[in-house]
Interface confidence: medium
Amino acid sequence: TQHGIRLPLRSGLGGAPLGLRLPRETDEEPEEPGRRGSFVEMVDNLRGKSGQGYYVEMTVGSPPQTLNILVDTGSSNFAVGAAPHPFLHRYYQRQLSSTYRDLRKGVYVPYTQGKWEGELGTDLVSIPHGPNVTVRANIAAITESDKFFINGSNWEGILGLAYAEIARPDDSLEPFFDSLVKQTHVPNLFSLQLCGAGFPLNQSEVLASVGGSMIIGGIDHSLYTGSLWYTPIRREWYYEVIIVRVEINGQDLKMDCKEYNYDKSIVDSGTTNLRLPKKVFEAAVKSIKAASSTEKFPDGFWLGEQLVCWQAGTTPWNIFPVISLYLMGEVTNQSFRITILPQQYLRPVEDVATSQDDCYKFAISQSSTGTVMGAVIMEGFYVVFDRARKRIGFAVSACHVHDEFRTAAVEGPFVTLDMEDCGYNIPQTDESTLMT
């Protein structure tokens, strides 16, 4: 949404000089029962790839109907295809479920591109490769959609894992994760490890490939290296966070940090790209172009419209810069940074015409609804959505794609002053358009 009035932006709020570090309070968070350790049954329970989303197998109804469900931290409805559609191999058949209850209420969800409508009901839901529980959850049975389901994506519904505030038709519709926590002993936390392929996958490879893990109720140490660093959830609607500084190859973009969060910054597994506000996008692209100037790329590449290809195995990763986002830390005046590689922000795609080549799309794009840390960011990290403590944790993913020279990183602490001023306060209007 374009706002007619923009609040005055403060300048000079960048991070302190690198190297000035604050001591961490503790190296690791204290152990909490049921929240850490090994979750073998949940590891590798996701499939898919960043371009079409990551999905988990779920069952709905009695007897159970198995469906693949997109894991989406950027929305809050559990919605499944409930009618034939050319892109669906299967769909939820309410009439076959003895436990389905109709709520006699419709729901409509428009996105920037695409939309769906359906009817609300409740049914019994479980996750075969998740906690051994069954919950009665709200389900939006999608009866009609446009540009929502993706041909060949292999998922038939969406699991919105964000908060009730952005649920449709309103915040009275309890999201799935809230129902899960209320009805079971599952701790109020989940974590995601999305594993980008690093190379294009054809249909048969996607169906056979492992896409990552959604650990429900805990943290699995085997999925990350190094330490987990936490940033506060600013407000419980989307998973909103605050970015306090942005660097391209260590060079500060030197923008008023409010710009980075205009009008919000969210962590969204249902979005492919790293999406940046217009001004930030323009500055970032200018800086990335300058850093990679040894090769010239068409304008369409930077707009995400054109592919660039190199002979198989010769992609010049080294000419592309790393990108660091500094996030507000849990301690006053302390931040930490997450750093991604071109292996994350150049998305491999298959170019039928030149199948011998390695082709990529630039997976950073412009946004009019704030920063969206989509799959290209998340694929570098193990991300902990610690709802109980209102914070999001980042650690280097054990499955992220890198080369022998550089790796994704999560590092801190750094001194950053006046970080609260980096948050943008959205004027109190109806923010329920769910634009993604």
């Epitope: 009618a83 559609h85 050319p86 409508e117 009609e144």
Partner: antibody, heavy 122, light 107 residues
Framework: EVELMESGGGLVKPGGSLKLSCAAS????????MHWVRQAPEKGLEWVAY????????YYTDTVRGRFTISRDNAKNTLFLQMTSLRSEDTAMYYC???????????????WGTGTSVTVSS | DIVMTQSQKFMSTSVGDRVSVTCKAS??????VAWYQQKPGQSPKALIY???YRYSGVPDRFTGSGSGTDFTLTISNVQSEDLADYFC?????????FGAGTKLEIK
């Protein structure tokens, strides 16, 4: 039994208006997208307009866009077609028809009403 | 718009015969084609959807075939009650379009 019954047709002068209704029974009306299809005398079938179950998806054929408005009242199980700026070429039998399955795959018409006749003539 | 062409306006057949009604799309529509029967003074009824799937309650003497641009409705063992107009329809893209119809006459 699944039934659709149109009403509201009649004789109207060019430039005039008419509102057609279609009463549905025997199925959960809000689950289904609904169409209007017309058939000029001794002619073939022509699709006119479509409205989805929740009224969020609405489509028209080019010749009626801007003149006709499709709507529905799910509480009353009724479909409407408001026709304005009528022309002689709008003369036809107007059928309401149910969209099969209410899913995005099958855009054929599985149940048809008996039709209501509209004549536009001076 | 996709044009659906039914080249035969009329077809004459006898009870017990087999008859094929054809329909050609102006561009590829996959299998997104339906066939309807309209008896004199009545509204149309669905016979076939997705080019070859028989609608529930339709006698198995009606079969549909084809994909892409060429489609056929075949009526084997024609009965007197099959006297009707037959229309094809594409639902591959908007606007939804019909063929002009083929009138089946029984000798």
């Amino acid at each position: 039994e699944v039934e659709l019954m149109e009403s509201g047709g009649g004789l109207v002068k060019p430039g005039g208006s008419l509102k057609l209704s279609c009463a549905a029974s025997g199925f959960t009306f809000s689950d289904y997208g609904m169409h209007w299809v017309r058939q000029a005398p001794e002619k073939g079938l022509e699709w006119v307009a479509y409205i989805s179950g929740g009224s969020n998806f609405i489509y028209y054929t080019d010749t009626v866009r801007g003149r006709f408005t499709i709507s529905r009242d799910n509480a009353k199980n009724t479909l409407f077609l408001q026709m304005t700026s009528l022309r002689s070429e709008d003369t036809a039998m107007y059928y309401c028809a149910r969209r099969a399955y209410y899913g995005s795959s099958y855009w054929y018409f599985d149940v048809w009403g008996t039709g209501t006749s509209v004549t536009v003539s001076s | 718009d996709i044009v659906m062409t039914q080249s035969q306006k009329f077809m004459s057949t006898s009870v017990g015969d087999r008859v094929s009604v054809t329909c050609k799309a102006s561009q590829n529509v996959g299998t997104n084609v339906a066939w309807y029967q309209q008896k004199p003074g009545q509204s149309p009824k669905a016979l076939i959807y997705s080019a070859s799937y028989r609608y529930s309650g339709v006698p198995d003497r009606f079969t549909g075939s084809g994909s892409g641009t060429d489609f056929t409705l075949t009526i084997s063992n024609v009965q007197s009650e099959d006297l009707a107009d037959y229309f094809c329809q594409q639902y591959s893209s908007y606007p939804l379009t019909f063929g002009a119809g083929t009138k089946l006459e029984i000798k």
